[in-house]
């Protein structure tokens, strides 16, 4: 898919039409990050339990297993985000795949994802008022990681 | 930060100026996902070695430790992406934080990130030729995860 660059719009960071014309969202749709879960979702139900599988996708084979929770908002771009939810407080033993090892903690890896919300612009009123795309950083957990507990100084 | 929607640009998916005016990439920079490393980069040199620290950022405390490698392309938006590079083939022992445990593999978690490349538009020539933003999925490794090896059926 190509976005064709044409002349006639010299300040694109603020060059977007009023709501009636609609294209900025079309454009944002292309420019937003791909947000389906990084790994194929688990085919087996045990991905929802605190155990490390010997098959299936990475999130179910990890000794810090996680599931993906959908976070959907039709008035946000991207509309769909997926949060990794750790299924165990500690890491699962590599030997058994089920017993937890208190020497390791299963913790989420967080990332600040840029998202956009549509807001009426300040001071704009009436039927043809302009809209602002409000950029926000939105915390998303990408995965769960097995770490050694932090030693306090 | 707000992006103000103004009138006067009725086809935003294809409304971008020629290269000399530069704004489309500025705008894309805002609209693309935040791509700095999820964790603060480690200040200590041991993050680059195959061991699990007891302090520091998550990528150095993980028993599947990783470093972040910068991937910069000035003709891509975002220009900077960070790839997680696993520092160990196997997971580090929770007990020692240094010896590797062959029962676990340290593997990257991949994600298809939407990126844009700037390309001359087909059939466009001359000094004021227009440019196209080509949307592509680009594989990025987000982190390294300790998993039980896959058992082949």
């Amino acid at each position: 898919v190509s976005l064709r660059i044409q002349e006639g719009c010299s300040h694109l960071p603020s060059c977007c039409p009023s709501k009636e014309q609609e294209p900025p969202e079309e454009w944002l749709k292309w420019s937003s990050a791909s947000v389906s879960p990084p790994e194929p979702l688990s085919h087996t139900h045990h991905a929802e339990s605190c155990r490390a599988s010997k098959d299936g996708p990475l999130n179910s084979r990890a000794i810090s297993p996680w599931s993906y929770e959908l976070d959907r908002d039709l008035n946000r771009v991207p509309q769909d985000l997926y949060h990794a939810r750790c299924l165990c407080p500690h890491c699962v033993s590599l030997q058994t795949g089920s017993h937890m090892d208190p020497l390791g903690n299963s913790v989420p890896l967080y990332h600040n994802q840029t998202v956009f919300y549509r807001r009426p612009c300040h001071g704009e009123e009436g039927t043809h008022r302009r809209y602002c795309l409000e950029r926000r950083l939105y915390r998303v957990s990408l995965a769960c990681v097995c770490v050694r507990p932090r030693v306090m100084a | 930060v707000s992006l103000r929607i103004q009138e006067g640009c009725s086809h935003l998916p294809s409304c971008c100026p020629s290269k000399e005016q530069e704004p489309p990439e500025e705008w894309l920079k805002w609209s693309s996902a935040s791509v700095s490393p999820p964790e603060p980069l480690s200040h200590t040199h041991h993050a680059e070695s195959c061991r699990a620290s007891k302090d520091g950022p998550l990528n150095s405390r993980a028993i599947s430790p990783w470093s972040y490698e910068l991937d910069r392309d000035l003709n891509r938006v975002p220009q900077d992406l960070y790839h997680a590079r696993c520092l160990c083939p196997h997971c580090v022992s929770l007990q020692t934080g240094s010896h590797m445990d062959p029962l676990g593999n340290s593997v990257p978690l991949y994600h298809n990130q939407t990126v844009f490349y700037r390309r001359p538009c087909h059939g466009e020539e001359g000094t004021h030729r227009r440019y196209c933003l080509e949307r592509r999925l680009y594989r990025v490794s987000l982190a390294c995860v300790c998993v039980r090896p896959r058992v082949m059926a």
């Epitope: 969202e25 979702l41 929770e69 959908l70 959907r72 008035n75 946000r76 549509r118 | -």
Partner: antibody
Framework: QVQLVQSGAEVKKPGASVKVSCKAS????????ISWVRQAPGQGLEWLGW????????KYAQKVQDRITMTTDASTTTAYMELRNLRSDDTAVYYC?????????????WGQGTLVTVSS | DIQMTQSPSSLSASVGDRVTITCRAS??????LNWYQQKPGKAPKLLIY???SLQSGVPLRFSGSGSGTDFTLTISSLQPEDFGIYIC?????????FGGGTKVEIK
């Protein structure tokens, strides 16, 4: 009672465009989204996409994303679905449905359907 | 895309019977599954959302269960007005997808 009332049946030639309307009433339009679903004769349901009524943000099914545009008009609480470059396999009943804007994306109220026939 | 497979494709049961329809997703969809009833020439009607929540106004004889990949719609005591096609839908990943439907006939 929530109501979604759709425009009437259409007969189009291949290559033409069709624009179906969906007038919503008896609820706060901007608090929901509108989804569009079609059903070819004797076939199952196919999701085409949706739009957040407040934001106008859309998500389209890949199969039709190059040919479809969904819009809303808050002043008349009406949603529109335009499909361009029609083909014979676009012949179907097109439904609009109300959808919540959050994670629980169920379609709790539906329009009566609009039959679009594409034939040369 | 996630495939939704319903079984059986059709069934015939008597008034008062307990009827069970299953829906299987090609991958884990957590609890993001809805059930609809569709009668000939009519729009679908929501029965169950998020796998087990009963939509307002739907009779208590309808219930839903399951999570992950396997889901069930149960009609505890079939009534004459329950004929029609029952359709499952996943909403976990776009594109949203529907099952092929189970046609329920009254004996």
């Amino acid at each position: 009672q929530v109501q979604l009332v759709q425009s009437g049946a259409e007969v189009k030639k291949p290559g033409a465009s069709v624009k179906v309307s969906c007038k919503a009433s008896e609820y706060t339009f901007s608090n929901y989204g509108i989804s569009w679903v079609r059903q070819a004769p004797g076939q199952g349901l196919e999701w085409l996409g949706w739009i957040g009524a407040y934001s106008g943000f859309t998500k389209y099914a890949q199969k039709v994303q190059d040919r479809i545009t969904m819009t809303t008009d808050a002043s008349t609480t009406t949603a529109y679905m335009e499909l361009r470059n029609l083909r014979s396999d676009d012949t179907a009943v097109y439904y609009c449905a109300r959808v919540g804007t959050g994670t629980d994306s169920y379609f709790d109220f539906w329009g009566q359907g609009t039959l679009v026939t594409v034939s040369s | 895309d996630i495939q939704m497979t319903q079984s059986p494709s059709s069934l015939s049961a008597s008034v008062g019977d307990r009827v069970t329809i299953t829906c299987r997703a090609s991958q884990n969809i957590n609890s993001h599954l809805n059930w609809y009833q569709q009668k000939p020439g009519k729009a679908p009607k929501l029965l169950i959302y998020t796998a087990s929540s009963l939509q307002s106004g739907v009779p208590l004889r309808f219930s839903g269960s399951g999570s992950g990949t396997d889901f069930t719609l149960t009609i505890s005591s079939l009534q004459p007005e329950d004929f029609g096609i029952y359709i499952c839908q996943q909403t976990y990943i776009t594109p949203l997808t529907f099952g092929g439907g189970t046609k329920v006939e009254i004996k």
